[in-house]
């Protein structure tokens, strides 16, 4: 039969290659079937018999068509500074992402080696650039007419309320205090909270920006609102 309609195993044409989802077995010198994702080669092909595939065992996986003798081990359970966003299945590895309030301070080839806690902005400073999956929060001083009275990795500077009669003027870390009962805002305050970074980095093995005023990245102590709980998610 011509190679394009041959059933595995078959000898390829001289100088030819095996088809999609097939591999060339050096021992048998034949084109043989690969195993589908979620399976592995239990018995390799011979000149007369094709590859025998078997399902991956618990906590192991294969993501691609393959002829590996054993499935890959899923990564260890997510560390307490991460959350499991994809469970370990026979066809895919576990994926761990940094928790809200964290970012990936130390990445690796696939995923995040260590999540780090986002810095917070002190009162009088607001978030100029929110944290992302791979960068830390950048803070800025609240401009005249605005304030932030929190220690937060999400709060921006908000405008002072405008008083008919001012009891206490506002400053960078405190809102104005009015004597009247119906203060107004100098502008629409907008969102007070910036969204937490959404991380899509995965972890496949064991766990573990240039700010305007202070260099470096944040560290490995969890921060609210979602600090790590004891223990972690299993398979």
């Amino acid at each position: 039969l011509p190679a394009q309609v041959a059933f595995t195993p078959y000898a390829p044409e001289p100088g030819g290659t095996c088809r999609l989802r097939e591999y060339y077995d050096q021992t048998a010198q034949m084109c043989c079937s690969k195993c589908p994702p979620g399976q592995h080669a239990k018995v390799f092909c011979t000149k007369t018999s094709d590859t025998v595939c078997d399902s991956c065992e618990d906590s192991t996986y294969t993501q691609l068509w393959n002829w590996v003798p054993e499935c890959l081990s899923c990564g260890s359970r997510c560390s307490s500074d991460q959350v499991e966003t994809q469970a370990c299945t026979r066809e895919q590895n576990r994926i761990c992402t940094c928790r809200p309030g964290w970012y990936c301070a130390l990445s690796k080839q696939e995923g995040c080696r260590l999540c780090a806690q986002l810095r917070k902005c002190r009162p009088g400073f607001g978030v100029a650039r929110p944290g992302t999956e791979t960068s830390d929060v950048v803070c800025k001083p609240c401009a005249p007419g605005t304030f932030s009275n929190t220690t937060s990795s999400t709060d921006i500077c908000r405008p002072h309320q405008i008083c008919h009669v001012v009891a206490i003027p506002g400053n960078a870390s405190m809102d104005a205090v009015c004597t009247s009962t119906s203060p107004t805002r100098s502008m629409a305050p907008g969102a007070v909270h910036l969204p937490q970074p959404v991380s899509t980095r995965s972890q496949h093995t064991q766990p573990t920006p240039a700010p305007s005023t202070a260099p470096g990245t944040s560290f490995l102590l969890p921060v609210g609102p979602s600090p790590p709980a004891e223990g972690s998610t299993g398979d």
Epitope: R122, C139, T213, G216, T217, F219, V223, G224, P227, P228
Partner: antibody, heavy 124, light 110 residues
Framework: EVQLVESGGGLVQPGGSLRLSCAAS????????INWVRQAPGKGLEWVGI???????NFANWAKGRFTISRDNSKNTLYLQMNSLRAEDTAVYYC??????????????????WGQGTLVTVSS | DIQMTQSPSSLSASVGDRVTITCQAS??????LAWYQQKPGKAPKLLIY???ILTSGVPSRFSGSGSGTDFTLTISSLQPEDFATYYC????????????FGGGTKVEIK
């Protein structure tokens, strides 16, 4: 002035329990992670555990199951409950804020300030 | 479990000497390292954070360097008030932590 003050230390028998307090002034405990660190006589610093801003706690492997940390925001006070105490738990216990303030930022990886420490002696 | 190995455990030096203390992490921690000074009967005092940033009020003779796994604390010209014990700290508090501090280096008068 930002300050932490520990209290509650003393002599306790092996197997006994003790609750240490850490009172904060000059800042709100609920906006910072707070650590407990101990130091046995003549030995180095040893991290005990942490309470995060959200109230969740985490501990060194050796402290899990025996020690708990809680917080009373209304009193701006932190507690370390120590159970099943052993002679090797004899140490000065410090509370330390996780968060150094600098140039508008709070750096959560650095411990500052620290309390003065309270001595716990476990002996029969 | 990230482990911090500090060396030497003790050293003798004279006033005016240049002193170097090293701290090695068992795995990379980027620049996320702090140094503390502790005097007998006192609580530790933060000297340096983020491996190289000097805490406000700390004399400029103290400096920190390093990234990844190897870090150094240097005192360029030792002063009488610098005789103390120094600790490095990594700060990770995940699921498998034994200690966040190095073993300490005691700087004594020669």
């Amino acid at each position: 002035e930002v300050q932490l003050v520990e209290s509650g230390g003393g002599l306790v028998q092996p197997g006994g329990s003790l609750r240490l307090s850490c009172a904060a002034s000059g800042f709100s405990l609920s906006t910072y992670d707070i650590n407990w660190v101990r130091q046995a006589p003549g030995k180095g610093l040893e991290w005990v555990g942490i309470i995060y801003t959200g109230g969740i706690t985490n501990f060194a492997n050796w402290a899990k199951g025996r020690f708990t940390i809680s917080r009373d925001n209304s009193k701006n006070t932190l507690y370390l409950q120590m159970n099943s105490l052993r002679a090797e738990d004899t140490a000065v216990y410090y509370c330390a804020r996780g968060g150094y303030d600098s140039e508008g930022y709070v750096y959560p990886d650095a411990f500052d300030p620290w309390g003065q420490g309270t001595l716990v002696t476990v002996s029969s | 479990d990230i482990q911090m190995t500090q060396s030497p455990s003790s050293l003798s030096a004279s006033v005016g000497d240049r002193v170097t203390i090293t701290c090695q992490a068992s795995e990379s921690i980027s620049n996320l390292l702090a140094w503390y000074q502790q005097k007998p009967g006192k609580a530790p005092k933060l000297l340096i954070y983020r491996a190289s940033i000097l805490t406000s009020g700390v004399p400029s003779r103290f400096s920190g360097s390093g990234s990844g796994t190897d870090f150094t604390l240097t005192i360029s010209s030792l002063q009488p008030e610098d005789f103390a014990t120094y600790y490095c700290q990594h700060g990770y508090t995940g699921t498998n932590v034994q200690n966040v501090f190095g073993g300490g280096t005691k700087v004594e008068i020669k």
